[in-house]
């Protein structure tokens, strides 16, 4: 990043002049944080606590089951993606507290803010994989009986992670530190080397591959699944599907502000009032997207309570019940309506 472009929210459009330097700053701007930044800090703190503990628990519960239970493989990978992203939060938190001063160096600037994008791509690709799995269970049960195994599930996850890493490379490559203001402040942001087309291309690819295309395909996928389930009046399957839809819906809800501001800023004139407003909201949009990293364990717990009627079991056993039920076809030939319903019902929340 030979130039430091603040027009795509890759965690950072920091042109404010606030400073916490102990020496007297030249500028007379307030040392108090902006309201959006304060809100972002609160969200980061909550997400870190819930995300680290919740996802660690999910990893612990599913890791033991991953060898024999395909659902556990899905949830293990989702939890790992969320857990990894949560590890960057203390650094991002510290940076906002210091008015976006970045004292952590160039390598950390490239890696840590990119983790949320890795999480976005990994999560949506894993959700797509899980959704395809659910679709096949409902519509191609015989194929599932013959080919659906742990090995294939791990391959699918590896492909999802590989693609996610590949799609995160632009953010990683175009991210650098630089200094501005008096007294000097180190900033971490993206730089597209005076290439507006490249910047817009990155924003469009992110919007299409990380949001619009998955939204379209998953909506179609779950519409078919729900129609099939409702047509068979499988009430428990519908309950389970509600959980699945909740996780998928939460992904799109929490990424929406980030994606909208990102695409808008890549097309707006940097001096325009709208751009300047969006720039101030950037940290908040990032923190809102980060809610994805802690929401899944919450959904699993709520789902577990729903399935149990009330919380009678311990948290690990409740999660185990939600996350590791397997959708295996036990009888080779008899694919009755009830068998298919049972499979749909047992493929638990995304």
């Amino acid at each position: 990043m030979d130039s430091f472009n603040y027009t795509t929210p890759d965690y950072g459009h920091y042109d404010d002049k606030d400073t916490l330097d102990l020496n007297t700053p030249v500028d007379k701007t307030s040392n108090t944080l902006r309201v959006p930044d304060i809100l972002a800090l609160v969200i980061f703190a909550v997400v870190f606590l819930v995300g680290v503990l919740g996802n660690a628990l999910v990893v612990w519960v599913t890791a033991f089951e991953a060898k024999r239970t395909i659902n556990a493989i899905w949830f293990l990978n989702l939890a790992v993606a969320d857990f990894l992203s949560c590890l960057a939060l203390p650094i991002l938190f510290t940076s906002i507290v210091q008015h976006h001063h970045w004292p952590f160096g160039g390598a950390a600037c490239s890696i840590l803010p990119s983790l949320i994008l890795l999480n976005m791509y990994a999560s949506i690709l894993l959700l797509a994989t899980i959704s395809a799995d659910r679709f096949l269970l409902v519509f191609k049960p015989i194929w599932c009986q013959n080919f659906r195994g742990a090995g294939l599930a791990w391959i699918a996850c590896a492909v999802a992670w590989g693609l996610a890493l590949l799609l995160t490379i632009p953010s990683f490559l175009y991210r650098v530190v630089r200094e501005e203001y008096f007294p000097p402040k180190v900033l971490c942001g993206v730089d597209y080397s005076h290439d507006k087309r490249r910047e817009r291309a990155v924003a469009i690819v992110r919007l299409v591959l990380g949001f619009l295309w998955p939204l379209l395909t998953l909506t179609i996928c779950y519409t078919f699944i729900l129609l099939r389930t409702w047509s068979r009046r499988a009430t428990r399957s519908t309950k389970t599907l509600k959980v699945v839809v909740a996780v998928v819906a939460s992904f799109f809800i929490f990424w929406l502000p980030y994606q909208v501001t990102g695409i808008m800023m890549s097309f707006l004139e940097p001096s325009s009032p709208t751009f300047l407003l969006l720039k101030k909201l950037d940290s908040l949009c990032v923190s809102f997207a980060y809610i994805n990293c802690c929401i899944n364990p919450i959904i699993y717990v709520v789902a577990g309570q729903g399935f149990q009627g009330r919380l009678r079991k311990s948290l690990p056993s409740l999660l185990r019940n939600v996350l590791t039920e397997e959708s295996v076809v036990r009888e080779s030939k008899s694919f009755t309506r009830s068998t298919v319903d049972t499979m749909a019902q047992k493929t638990q929340a995304v």
Epitope: S3, D15, N23, E179, F182, P183, H194
Partner: antibody
Framework: QVQLRQSGPGLVQPSQSLSITCTVS????????VHWVRQSPGKGLEWLGV???????DYNAAFISRLSISKDYSKSQIFLTMNSLQTDDTAIYYC????????????WGQGTTLTVSS | DIVMSQSPSSLAVSAGEKVTMSCKSS????????????LAWYQQKPGQSPKLLIY???TRESGVPDRFTGSGSGTDFTLTISSVQAEDLAVYYC????????FGGGTKLEIK
């Protein structure tokens, strides 16, 4: 490659205003700050002010009342405007890019020679 | 305001000799947050725009010959040219960018 090209009047009458344009290429104004520095005949360098990547400005206290720096992102241009010119404002005026690290001036314009005389 | 003073104001040396010039600031240029000294050295050859040589007191700008070395911390800084070449004929300025930038008066280097 990075370039800063300056254009402006060579001669201005006392009490008049000065306008110099610095057109940049090879980098984006959304990414780098641009400073203005002047050098009076036979004298040293004097920092005038800066416009940062986000559009905020800082000025030398000695010039704050009569100096203004602005920019046009789309045209990659920075503008220096100075009012109430006196003969001691005769100098070479430079625009310079703020470096990525160190808050230094890593690329300079060719300079605009200004003579304030009646 | 931070005031920068350079010494000597001029010096004449023969090619191949070692040269040191001094720069002092009225207050420390060490930033507690970044742990860097915000002092830079510039070279201005006759009829040319200034050129950045050193930043952060001791970091050489890319493309600058390694005979140029910056040192010092806090308020006292030095630029050393280990073996002066004919093309080094210039005025050398130090500049602080810890706060609003201020240049030193310059040291004129002449070749005997």
């Amino acid at each position: 490659q990075v370039q800063l090209r300056q254009s402006g009047p060579g001669l201005v009458q006392p009490s008049q205003s000065l306008s110099i344009t610095c057109t940049v290429s090879g980098f984006s104004l959304t990414s780098y700050g641009v400073h203005w520095v002047r050098q009076s005949p036979g004298k040293g360098l004097e920092w005038l002010g800066v416009i940062w990547s986000g559009g905020s400005t800082d000025y030398n206290a000695a010039f704050i009342s009569r100096l203004s720096i602005s920019k046009d992102y789309s045209k990659s241009q920075i503008f220096l405007t100075m009012n109430s010119l006196q003969t001691d404002d005769t100098a070479i005026y430079y625009c310079a890019r703020n470096s990525r690290l160190g808050n230094c001036f890593d690329y300079w314009g060719q300079g605009t020679t200004l003579t304030v005389s009646s | 305001d931070i005031v920068m003073s350079q010494s000597p104001s001029s010096l004449a040396v023969s090619a191949g000799e070692k040269v040191t010039m001094s720069c002092k600031s009225s207050q420390s240029l060490l930033n507690s947050r970044t742990r860097k000294n915000y002092l830079a050295w510039y070279q201005q050859k006759p009829g040319q725009s200034p050129k950045l040589l050193i930043y952060w007191a001791s970091t050489r700008e890319s493309g600058v010959p390694d005979r140029f070395t910056g040192s010092g911390s806090g308020t006292d800084f030095t630029l050393t040219i280990s073996s002066v070449q004919a093309e080094d004929l210039a005025v050398y300025y130090c500049k602080q960018s810890y706060n609003l930038p201020a240049f030193g008066g310059g040291t004129k280097l002449e070749i005997k």
